[in-house]
Interface confidence: medium
């Protein structure tokens, strides 16, 4: 067992080295380890094959370090890995698209607060078991087409607190099991009419605190299971172009936030849901 760590066998074979001031992944981690806790250290680099010997590893926590680089092959051989927490490593900024390849059993991936500026093509390829993906509080500006295409079992996608300005047509393709999509606190000004086409099981959609002045109801039509919708804190324009959204909200049987109008001035602060159809004049 590495000097700064505690190793024990029950309930699972565990190597625990949190908050020890470690500057590198320690050598000598027992190969039988099922859980490795390395959070709260000063680790800046995860070299290739750092955990290759740990074939039984199911949980790896590297959150709250100072990671600036993760080699593409850092997690090679971890076919049984279920939880990977890389959150709170603000200097990371980018992740090689091959980093998570081969992690076919991964169900939880934390990449929040990592300073990520982009999601490289194929970053989440092959993560068919993934259920929870945490990407909030990064610096993401765009959602590339088909980024999440392989994540057919994903139920929770956290994208809030980024700089995303639009939701393109293919951003959420393949997310057939998604239950909760949090997109609040971004800069979203435009949602493609077909952006949510695959989200037939979505129950919760948070779009509050964005830059939306309009939302095509065609985008909301596929959301057959939707129960919770939050649209507040957006600069909604309540003119005749808002009539389809107004009509959709009247029929919506779930719970929705207020939709306060910004324009025209005479309706500023009024809730779109509570307006009458003939309030929505002029274009």
């Amino acid at each position: 067992c590495p000097g700064a760590c505690v190793c024990y066998n029950e309930p699972k074979v565990t190597t625990s080295c949190p908050q020890q001031g470690l500057q590198a992944v320690p050598v000598g981690i027992p190969a039988a380890s099922q859980r490795i806790f390395l959070h709260g250290n000063r680790i800046s680099h995860v070299p290739a094959a750092s955990f290759r010997a740990c074939r039984n590893l199911t949980i790896l926590w590297l959150h709250s370090n100072v990671l600036a680089r993760i080699d593409a092959a850092a997690f090679t051989g971890l076919a049984l890995l279920e939880q990977l927490d890389l959150s709170d490593n603000a200097q990371l900024r980018s992740v090689d698209p091959a980093t998570f390849h081969g992690l076919g059993r991964l169900h939880t991936l934390h990449l929040d607060r990592c300073g990520l500026q982009e999601l490289g093509p194929g970053l989440f390829r092959g993560l068919a078991a993934l259920q929870y993906l945490y990407l909030q509080d990064n610096a993401l500006q765009a959602l590339p087409d088909d980024t999440f295409r392989d994540l057919g079992n994903l139920t929770h996608l956290f994208l809030h607190g980024n700089r995303i300005s639009s939701v393109p047509e293919r951003a959420f393709r393949g997310l057939h099991s998604l239950d909760r999509l949090l997109l609040h606190q971004n800069r979203v000004a435009h949602v493609h009419p077909h952006a949510f086409r695959d989200l037939g099981r979505l129950m919760t959609l948070y779009l509050f605190a964005n830059n939306l002045s309009a939302l095509p109801t065609e985008a909301l039509a596929p959301l057959r299971a939707l129960q919770y919708l939050r649209l507040n804190d957006n600069p909604w324009v309540c003119d005749c172009r808002a009539r389809p959204l107004w009509a959709w909200l009247q029929k919506f049987r779930g719970s929705s936030s207020e939709v306060p109008c910004s324009l025209p001035q005479r309706l500023a602060g009024r809730d779109l849901k509570r307006l009458a159809a003939n309030d929505l004049q002029g274009c």
Partner: antibody, heavy 119, light 110 residues
Framework: EVQLLESGGGLVQPGGSLRLSCAAS????????MSWVRQAPGKGLEWVSA????????YYADSVKGRFTISRDNSKNTLYLQMNSLRAEDTAVYYC????????????WGRGTLVTVSS | QSVLTQPPSVTGVPGQRVTISCSGS????????ISWYQQLSGEAPKLLVF???VPSSGVSDRFSASKSGTSASLAISALRSGDEGDYYC???????????FGGGTKLTVL
Amino acid sequence: EVQLLESGGGLVQPGGSLRLSCAASGFTFSSYAMSWVRQAPGKGLEWVSAISGSGGSTYYADSVKGRFTISRDNSKNTLYLQMNSLRAEDTAVYYCALHYYGLGSFDFWGRGTLVTVSS
Amino acid sequence: QSVLTQPPSVTGVPGQRVTISCSGSTSMIERADISWYQQLSGEAPKLLVFANVVPSSGVSDRFSASKSGTSASLAISALRSGDEGDYYCAAFHDGLNDWVFGGGTKLTVL
């Protein structure tokens, strides 16, 4: 690292007033809703009030409606709770809490500040 | 009196698995977001699980939650003496903007 530090608690007479503060750091304060939650001595947790990130929306438990006012100063990364017409049953440790993953949970908590209402 | 009902106390021995229930009306549980909190003696509460079943970052995999109908539950496996404390469920109703806590359950590890 998210940090929340409450202050302003103390002993006050029934009918009196007190203003609690919660200094926040380690996250973009203006982006997140915040709440106050209290715990009377030896009792359970009770939600008191919440406020949206912008400060434009506020919510109150029935037990404090009309007496307490929640506010925030995003330029100072500080949350406030102005408590007026205090009653003996308001005696509690008051915690500020951050709604980080959305409104559905209290994701980070301060250590709390004790408010005692007694003559 | 809380509208979310928890058992006042639960007792277990080290290594055992215990379950804490949280029950209420259909509207209180089924249509709400349930979260779970741990409060150790003299400390502030700490989030364990949010959005019904999602473990909070840094929380041991010994803690798991489920929700079905009018009941939610928190399971703690491989019990340790350090798990002793109070556990609370909470429900949030989006749209009502109302948060309600259960009465709390005191967990004792013998």
